[in-house]
Interface confidence: low
């Protein structure tokens, strides 16, 4: 049968906690022995671990309230897939019975003495009551027993005297409006109310007492908002040190709105909490050097050879660059001033060529002039000779890459009457005017 499966079993209460879901078998639920299950909602919770006895329940109340009785307690075999000690199946209850005694003896009733004399009338004018009493000692009760009935009785009595009427206050009148609309100002706000000694007035014959207390009262007004306190600036703090070691910097002074702090909706201090000043170190800042762009590669040559052009003979070439702009002990340029590489010279070499595909369209030229056009080209591209791409120039220094250098003379079949470049031009459409963006903002 399907069961409700839970993720926890609470040992102290025997309850299932953390519902995982219903409609699963006991076997599937108990794949995790930390889980627990119920056969129906609110039913007995059984843990999935191997069966063992629960803790003993508390002792039930004693079967009688006085003299000797007995009381029960139980424990249950809880768990799954096994038995508790004594070969007992899960769900089985085991009982213990012990003697108990809440009170050694049982209560016994007592008996009343005779009524005592009537006490004086409870009032000195008009009508009241008088009382008489009796004692529960004839005989006295035992073991917490009592006597049946009342220990005193009362009856009406009449003094035959007219009572004076004492004054009593009528209800308080309304509170007057507060003397101020907020508290914490120069005058503490108060409200006042009064009342009359007329509910009733004191009688003249026989004379009644006047009303006790005062005919008016005052109190501090509650619930009023505190009076607003406007904020005030404290003094300017010290000027901060100049934060730079060269050129111009900015120092700052600060002040705090705490003289006093604004309170209860009072306005914050007007003006700025900080002010700044320029500070001048009178020291020029260092300027780091920056490399110019590389110069042109020198011609590709080989020492002791007049020309290596159009031959499978590797040579060397170099290019240089200049470190510019270093001043005031700035950093020198990092890296090499000269670059050397190995090369094959194809300067002015007649090479077989082939026409390239069309290039992408270029930019519109002139960008701000009349009738700008864009162009694309097909170029007669030389087919480079299949010389070795790396060479070993010096024993033990490994292979070096070799680059082709120079402008060859490619030979292509004529295309549209051209031998080197075929160009196609088109006008650019819907051309916007060139305007200085700075001027546009103004």
């Amino acid at each position: 049968d399907p069961v409700l499966c839970f993720t926890q079993y609470e040992e102290s209460s025997g309850k299932c906690k953390g519902l995982l879901g219903g409609g699963v078998s006991v076997e599937d639920c108990c794949l995790n022995t930390a889980f627990a299950y119920q056969k129906r909602s609110g039913g007995l919770c059984q843990p999935c671990r191997s069966p063992r006895w629960s803790l003993w329940s508390t002792w039930a109340p004693c079967s009688v309230t006085c003299s000797e009785g007995s009381q029960l307690r139980y424990r249950r075999c809880v768990g799954w897939n096994g038995q508790c000690s004594g070969k007992v199946a899960p769900g089985t209850l085991e009982w213990q019975l012990q003697a108990c005694e809440d009170q050694q003896c049982c209560p016994e009733m007592g008996g009343w003495s005779g009524w005592g004399p009537w006490e004086p009338c409870s009032v000195t004018c008009s009508k009241g009551t008088r009382t008489r009493r009796r004692a529960c000692n004839h005989p006295a009760p035992k073991c917490g027993g009592h006597c049946p009935g009342q220990a005193q009785e009362s009856e009406a009595c009449d003094t035959q005297q007219v009572c004076p009427t004492h004054g009593a206050w009528a209800t308080w009148g309304p509170w007057t409006p507060c003397s101020a609309s907020c508290h914490g100002g120069p005058h503490e706000p108060k409200e006042t109310r009064s009342r009359k000694c007329s509910a009733p007035e004191p009688s003249q014959k026989p004379p009644g007492k006047p009303c006790p207390g005062l005919a008016y009262e005052q109190r501090r007004c509650t619930g009023l908002p505190p009076c607003p306190v406007a904020g005030g600036w404290g003094p300017w703090g010290p000027v901060s040190p100049c934060p730079v070691t060269c050129g111009l910097g900015q120092t700052m002074e600060q002040r705090t709105c705490n003289h006093p702090v604004p309170q209860h909706g009072g306005p914050f201090c007007a003006g700025d909490a900080t002010r700044t000043h320029i500070c001048n170190t009178a020291v020029p800042c260092p300027v780091d050097g920056e490399w110019d762009s590389w110069g042109e590669w020198s011609p590709c040559i080989r020492r002791n050879m007049k020309s290596i052009s159009c031959q499978e003979i590797p040579g060397q070439q170099s290019r240089g660059r200049t470190c510019r702009g270093r001043k005031f002990d700035g950093h020198r340029c990092a890296g090499q001033q000269q670059d050397i590489r190995h090369c094959y010279s194809i300067q002015h070499c007649p090479l077989k060529g082939s026409w390239s595909e069309w290039s992408t369209w270029g930019l519109c030229m002139p960008p701000c002039g009349p009738n700008p056009t864009r162009a694309r080209q097909r170029l007669c591209t030389p087919l480079l000779p299949k010389y070795p791409p790396t060479v070993s120039m010096v024993e033990g220094q490994g292979e070096k890459n070799v680059t082709f250098w120079g402008r060859p003379l490619p030979r292509c079949e004529e295309l549209q009457g051209q031998k080197l470049v075929v160009e196609e031009k088109r006008p650019c459409l819907h051309v916007p005017a060139c305007k200085d963006p700075e001027e546009e903002e103004l």
């Epitope: 409700l4 309850k15 299932c16 906690k17 953390g18 519902l19 879901g21 909602s41 609110g42």
Partner: nanobody
Amino acid sequence: QVHLVESGGGLVQAGGSLRLSCAASGRTFSSYAMGWFRQPPGKERQFVAAITWSGSSIYYADSIKGRFTISRDNAKNTVYLQMNSLKPEDTAVYYCAAEETSAYSGSYYYMMGDSYSYWGQGTQVTVSG
């Protein structure tokens, strides 16, 4: 066993209000946690609101906070959903659900439809633009 019947649905203009009721049969209504869920047309069922057996803890979906209020009257065996400032996206079939409180461990469970054993047949709420 608890039997749940929803009522109070209908057609209302955007910005209007409706009050849904869910009447439960059974003497132990006060020991059940109650939830409202909704299923918009063509979408999955969504959690709306839930209330514990005593009403001491209440949970709402973010999409309806401040507009819908869940409450219960254990003497009348009824849970209510007061819906104000209704929007066209509130259009859905609204379902009432119940589960014995002992089965729960925290707010996460109240927001999962699978946590509830008993469901009503639903009431249609349509909000026109």
